[in-house]
């Protein structure tokens, strides 16, 4: 259930050189510095556990400060193949190749990896985000153009002695950051090949990876302030539930979202919030320092445990699901956006969830671990929590079986 198995070499302890190697903020993604090519070209790369391509800007774009210049790399190899990635909104397309890649604040290794050189995009790069590419850390099944394109992490593990595991600590600031503050701020840590004990408190609890495509997990119960939403647990995972560092919000299937909002509204009814707030359209503000965190409920997601009929729960605070935003027009107040939204592609446990926890992507053992993050934002009365075990029966029934078709799965 918890992290009690014997220590394994290279998998535990301290990874000082990798701590604090992420920057950014939940609204625009967390990025790590990487180098590509020979001589090395430095780029900031979005860490995305919801996709599987390593793709970088490779042509001028109004939102990019720099981009990968293949012609300047003596080690670039053209795969003479294009790649096109459409999303529900937006897309990117480019040319496939390989080159030497390393992570300066990561393991001291260089690997030859597949790179999609993005030559054209729409609604992909974000103005002011400070990243120029994306590191898809999920599995080959969802790689584009097909699962034969080996993802970066697979190449890393295959070509080096780095254990098949990484962990993420995303640190929400708890207050809005301007551009210069983001550049100076610590955004968190990506520990490649191990677990750093300094980044969490308490125990790590593991949930099985249901299927190796996205990092798919199974939610078996949802509570708002301890009150069960009382829905058929299949609804929570319709049509899947994934852990995705590249998504800002906690996204919930339509029925679940509606039930959750109804329950959060009821719990916070001492104030009347506009309908637009629950839609993510309107901000709510309070005089600086007076945000009434206590009127908002905690949200608990129960995840399938590693042992039959056993589950554990992760609990987030309003400090995670109310995202601080800066607006010059209301700068004298503390303003927030509701960071839970509706999804038509299942539950997405985005930065809103991940900022509460240290999350271990233990690919070697096909499981994801959660522990309370040492950097999560909380107050003197409540803290995020990871607790268990709980007895939960028939958890396998909570998984939704997606009908197999030939259609693309990656329509995010």
């Amino acid at each position: 259930e918890t992290d009690e198995e014997p220590e394994e070499p290279g998998r535990r302890g301290s990874f000082v050189e990798m701590v604090d190697n992420l920057r950014g903020k939940s609204g625009q993604g967390y990025y790590v510095e990487m180098t590509v090519g020979s001589p090395p070209q430095t780029l900031n790369i979005l860490v995305d556990t919801g996709s599987s391509n390593f793709a970088v800007g490779a042509a001028p774009h109004p939102f990019l400060h720099r981009y990968y210049q293949r012609q300047l790399s003596s080690t670039y190899r053209d795969l003479r193949k294009g790649v096109y990635v459409p999303y529900t909104q937006g897309k990117w397309e480019g040319e496939l190749g390989t080159d030497l890649v390393s992570i300066p604040h990561g393991p001291n290794v260089t690997v030859r990896a597949n790179i999609a050189a993005i030559t054209e995009s729409d609604k992909f790069f974000i103005n002011g985000s400070n990243w120029e590419g994306i590191l898809g850390l999920a599995y080959a099944e969802i790689a584009r153009p097909d699962d034969s394109l080996e993802p970066f992490f697979d190449s890393l593990v295959k070509q080096t002695h780095v254990p098949n595991l990484f962990s993420l600590q995303l640190c929400g600031a708890g207050f809005p950051l301007n551009q210069s503050e983001v550049l100076a701020s610590v955004g968190g840590s990506m520990i490649i090949g191990g677990i750093d004990h300094s980044l969490y408190t308490g125990s790590l609890w593991y949930t099985p990876i249901r299927r190796e495509w996205y990092y798919e997990v199974i939610i078996v119960r949802v509570e708002i302030n301890g009150q069960d939403l009382k829905m058929d647990c299949k609804e929570y995972n319709y049509d899947k539930s994934i852990v995705d560092s590249g998504t800002t919000n906690l996204r919930l299937p339509k029925k679940v979202f509606e039930a959750a909002v109804k329950s959060i509204k009821a719990a916070s009814s001492t104030e009347k919030f506009p309908d637009g707030f629950w839609l993510g359209e309107q901000l709510v503000c309070w005089q600086a320092g007076t945000t009434p965190w206590n009127i908002f409920p905690v949200i608990s997601l129960y995840l399938m445990g590693e042992v039959t009929n056993q589950s554990f729960r992760i609990t987030i605070l309003p400090q995670q699901y109310l995202r601080p935003v800066e607006d010059v027009a209301t700068s004298q107040d503390d303003c927030y956006k509701f960071a839970i939204s509706q999804s038509s592609t299942g539950t997405v446990m985005g930065a809103v969830i991940m900022e509460g926890f240290y999350v271990v992507f233990d690919r070697a053992r096909k499981r994801i671990g959660f522990a309370v993050s040492a950097c999560h934002v909380h107050d003197e009365f409540r803290t995020a929590a990871v607790e268990g075990p709980f007895v939960t029966l028939d958890m396998e029934d909570c998984g939704y079986n997606i009908p197999q078709t030939d259609e693309s799965t990656l329509m995010t």
Partner: antibody
Framework: EVQLQQSGAELVRPGTSVKLSCKAS?????SYWIHWVKQRPGQGLEW???????????KYNQKFKDKATLTVDTSSSTTYMHLSSLTSEDSAVYYC?????????WGQRTLVTVSA | DILMTQSQKFMSTSVGDRVSVTCKAS??????VAWYQQISGQSPKPLIY???HRYSGVPDRFTGSGSGTDFTLTISNVQSEDLVEFFC?????????FGGGTKLEIK
């Protein structure tokens, strides 16, 4: 500095259509919804609808759902409003506005005149 | 739809006076009301949000109050540049609606 730059005045024939634009700058375009508001002399302000630039989700005032269509082009940080089957009732000043708390930022106005 | 009623189309005042513009909602809108000022031929300028919070840069002679259905914009020490039109707006529920406006005039 947040700015919403609207397209220029339009003189159009009845029965035709027109597309107004609103170019945003000074903030992360996909982080805030854009609204459109109509103002006719002596008729006050009317909310037409809104669009979320991050995913093009739209919500309309029922009164305008068959009249207005909102779209967005994130590459140019521009929102568009297409008005169809124009009549003299559509002659008005149109504003785009950015969300936040209520509408803290407004475009400078676009005058549409429908005349034969 | 929520009807926002500004019963006085015009109000007479003098420079230096204190004047209160009122707005009534047809149903409870909490404190989700904004006030705008509009000079003829220009865009509305935001003054107040959440019934009583001033937007950045708005002079403190503008004060908002009220909750539920009754709202007031008070201008103390009226200046000549304040002799324009004022609109209230509810942003509690869709469709967002505005009051018909109140114009301040010189006595």
């Amino acid at each position: 500095e947040v700015q919403l730059q609207q397209s220029g005045a339009e003189l159009v024939r009845p029965g035709t259509s027109v597309k107004l634009s609103c170019k945003a700058s000074g903030y992360t375009f996909t982080s805030y919804w854009i609204h459109w508001v109509k103002q006719r002399p002596g008729q006050g302000l009317e909310w037409i609808g809104m669009i979320d630039p991050s995913d093009s989700y739209t919500k309309y005032n029922q009164k305008f759902k068959d009249k207005a269509t909102l779209t967005v082009d994130t590459s140019s940080s521009t929102t568009y409003m297409h008005l169809s089957s124009l009549t003299s009732e559509d002659s008005a000043v149109y504003y785009c506005a950015r969300s936040g708390v209520a509408f803290p930022y407004w475009g400078q106005r676009t005058l549409v005149t429908v005349s034969a | 739809d929520i009807l926002m009623t500004q019963s006085q189309k015009f109000m007479s005042t003098s420079v230096g006076d204190r004047v209160s513009v009122t707005c009534k909602a047809s149903q409870n809108v909490g404190r989700n009301v904004a006030w705008y000022q509009q000079i003829s031929g220009q865009s509305p300028k935001p003054l107040i949000y959440s019934a009583s919070h001033r937007y950045s840069g708005v002079p403190d002679r503008f004060t908002g109050s009220g909750s539920g259905t009754d709202f007031t914009l008070t201008i103390s020490n009226v200046q000549s540049e304040d002799l324009v039109e004022f609109f209230c707006q509810q942003y509690n529920s869709y469709p967002y609606t505005f009051g018909g406006g109140t114009k301040l005039e010189i006595k």
